[in-house]
């Protein structure tokens, strides 16, 4: 038994972040004279929170009427908690000392949690394209959530990846917390349509997970085949080369024609079609004047795709010269190959 | 239940100091104050000073330079010390609990005299 | 210091009849919403014995024939009725400023 007792009858209490907190707190007597006073923390760095003698506090607001006679009740509301408001607030009576008020008893205090949600997850691949057949790297980053305890899961197309690597952030005590996710995927040459997803499930979520995506587009680089054939004879003394160029991705693509090496014509792909799996086809042709060769034309489709190195495909006209009398034509063979 | 009991010589010499002793049961005094009040006879009632639960201490200014009050909480006692006294401090000597006094002891009286 | 005045000095009331004290402070003694004044009855030869505390608030085991009011410097201890037990010495007593004082006193006759 005390003389005077403050009473903090909540050990915890749990807020949303955005909610507005009330600590409850009673005094057995009024006596002695003496203002009760707030404060975050303990000792001698603890925050004063109010003060019922003096200061401005807009955050803060009494539950009852301080003014009123008789009142003990010197409960607080805290408006718009954030994760920086987290801690222990301890409700404390001053005695009217000479010349300054002396501590004279202290609540046991009450520790205020706030639960704070996650800021929604930001997945990040990697800088550059990469080819299917390769591991690529995503990250998923969400910041400001309490208390600490998170789950994270990542998935491609729906199904549950199980290679990554997951920290929170701070490890001890904080108002709040990071995650930070490092997920591994295997790129194939169908994922130009494919989604990662970073999902994360927080108490404050209340069973409704926050999901980042990334689009595989942003990440593969699918290379084209090349094929070149040579049509049937279209009129006299002319053939017609086409290069089909297949299933890659992205679009952006330059094909040039060499004639014996030398450059014939250099065009950039525009009309292509569109496959199922999201790559993309193209066809260019060349027409040869075959009259105009003496000897036999080597004609090579070159590519090059997305910036990477050009990839090229051969095919060798042969020119047999038969005299005009005879009116024999220009016979032409297919010897493709394939150079890079 | 709550009691105080003064005890003391009840003669004093003047220049000498008055050493007076409130023993108390049914509280802690680590829980609660307790005040000494005097009475000059036929007169009204002085607040001497009070030993806090924490055992700071505060005194009338008028009487501050000659008096201390201090506490053995493992006897459950008070102690009021009262030097260079003169008849002026001739009394009824009171302690009181804590800052609303709603306990007294009967009184002790202490004459101060040569 | 605070000074506590009292009046009457002294008063005679008959049994039955209402007996009124009042106690004016030389400065206020009203903080935090409360007034740090109070009452005691005493009788010779005896301490005196807490009434009202916080200016209007009985003590237990008072009987309800005692009541306090008052705010800041003005204050009145009401006795009403009163029964011929009542006489004694009535003190303010104030503890919202050091050094606390009493009142001179009253002294309440019964006749």
């Known amino acids: 038994e005390e003389e005077l007792q403050v009473i903090q009858p909540d050990k915890s209490v749990l807020v949303a972040a955005g909610e507005t907190a009330t600590l409850r707190c009673t005094a057995t007597s009024l006596i002695p004279v003496g203002p009760i006073q707030w404060f975050r923390g303990a000792g001698p760095g603890r925050e004063l929170i109010y003060n019922q003698k003096e200061g401005h506090f807009p955050r803060v607001t009494t539950v009852s009427d301080l003014t009123k006679r008789n009142n003990m009740d010197f409960s607080i509301r805290i408006g718009n908690i954030t994760p920086a408001d987290a801690g222990t607030y301890y409700c404390v009576k001053f005695r009217k000392g000479s010349p300054d008020d002396v501590e004279f008893k202290s609540g046991a205090g009450t520790e205020l949690s706030v639960r704070a949600k996650p800021s929604a997850p930001v997945v990040s691949g990697p800088a550059a394209r990469a080819t299917p057949q390769h591991t690529v790297s995503f990250t998923c980053e969400s910041h400001g959530f309490s208390p600490r305890d998170i789950t994270l899961k990542w998935f491609k197309n729906g199904n549950e990846l199980s290679d990554f690597q997951t920290n929170v952030d701070p490890v001890g005590e904080s108002v709040s917390y990071s995650i930070h996710s490092t997920a591994k995927v295997v790129l194939t040459r169908e994922d130009v349509h494919s989604q990662v997803i970073c999902e994360v499930a927080h108490v404050t979520l209340q069973g409704d997970p926050l999901r980042g995506t990334a689009n595989l587009s942003e990440t593969i680089r699918v290379p084209p085949t090349l094929e070149v054939t040579q049509q049937p004879v279209r009129a006299e003394n002319q053939v017609n080369v086409t290069c089909q160029v297949r299933k890659f991705y992205p679009q952006r693509l330059q094909l040039t024609w060499l004639e014996n090496g030398n450059v014939s014509r250099t065009e950039t792909a525009s009309t292509v079609t569109e496959n199922k799996d999201g790559t993309y086809n193209w066809m260019s042709w060349l027409l040869v004047n075959v009259s105009a060769h003496r000897d036999d034309v080597k004609l090579t489709c070159q590519v090059e795709h997305d910036g990477q190195p050009a990839v090229s495909k051969s095919h060798d006209l042969k020119v047999s010269a038969h005299p005009k009398e005879q009116g024999s034509n220009t016979a032409a063979e297919n010897t493709g190959s394939n150079e890079r | 239940q709550v009691q105080l009991q003064e005890s003391g010589p009840g003669l004093v010499k003047p220049s000498q100091t008055l050493s007076l002793t409130c023993t108390v049961s049914?509280?802690?005094?680590?829980?609660?104050?307790v005040n000494w009040i005097r009475q000059p006879p036929g007169k009204g009632l002085e607040w001497i000073g009070i030993i806090w639960g924490d055992g700071s201490t505060d005194y009338n200014s008028a009487l501050k330079s000659r008096v201390t009050i201090s506490v053995d909480t493992s006897k459950n006692q008070v102690f009021l010390k009262l030097s260079s006294v003169t008849a002026a401090d001739t009394a009824v000597y009171y302690c009181?609990?804590?800052?609303?006094?709603?306990?007294w002891g009967q009184g002790t009286t202490v004459t101060v005299s040569s | 210091d605070i000074v506590l005045t009292q009046s009457p000095a002294s008063l005679a009331v008959s049994p039955g009849q209402r007996a009124t004290i009042t106690c004016r402070a030389s400065e206020s003694v009203d903080s935090y919403g409360n007034s740090f004044m109070h009452w005691y009855q005493q009788k010779p030869g005896q301490p005196p014995k807490p009434l009202i505390y916080?200016?209007?608030n009985l003590e237990s085991g008072v009987p309800a024939r005692f009541s306090g009011s008052g705010s800041r410097t003005d204050f009145t201890l009401t006795i009403n009725p009163v029964e011929a037990n009542d006489a004694a010495n009535y003190y303010c007593?104030?503890?919202?400023?050091?050094?606390?004082?009493f009142g001179g006193g009253t002294k309440v006759e019964i006749k």
């Open positions: 916080l200016a209007s």
């Open positions: 007593q104030q503890n919202n400023e050091y050094p606390w004082t």
């Open positions: 009181a609990r804590a800052g609303k006094m709603d306990y």
């Open positions: 049914g509280f802690s005094l680590t829980g609660y104050g």
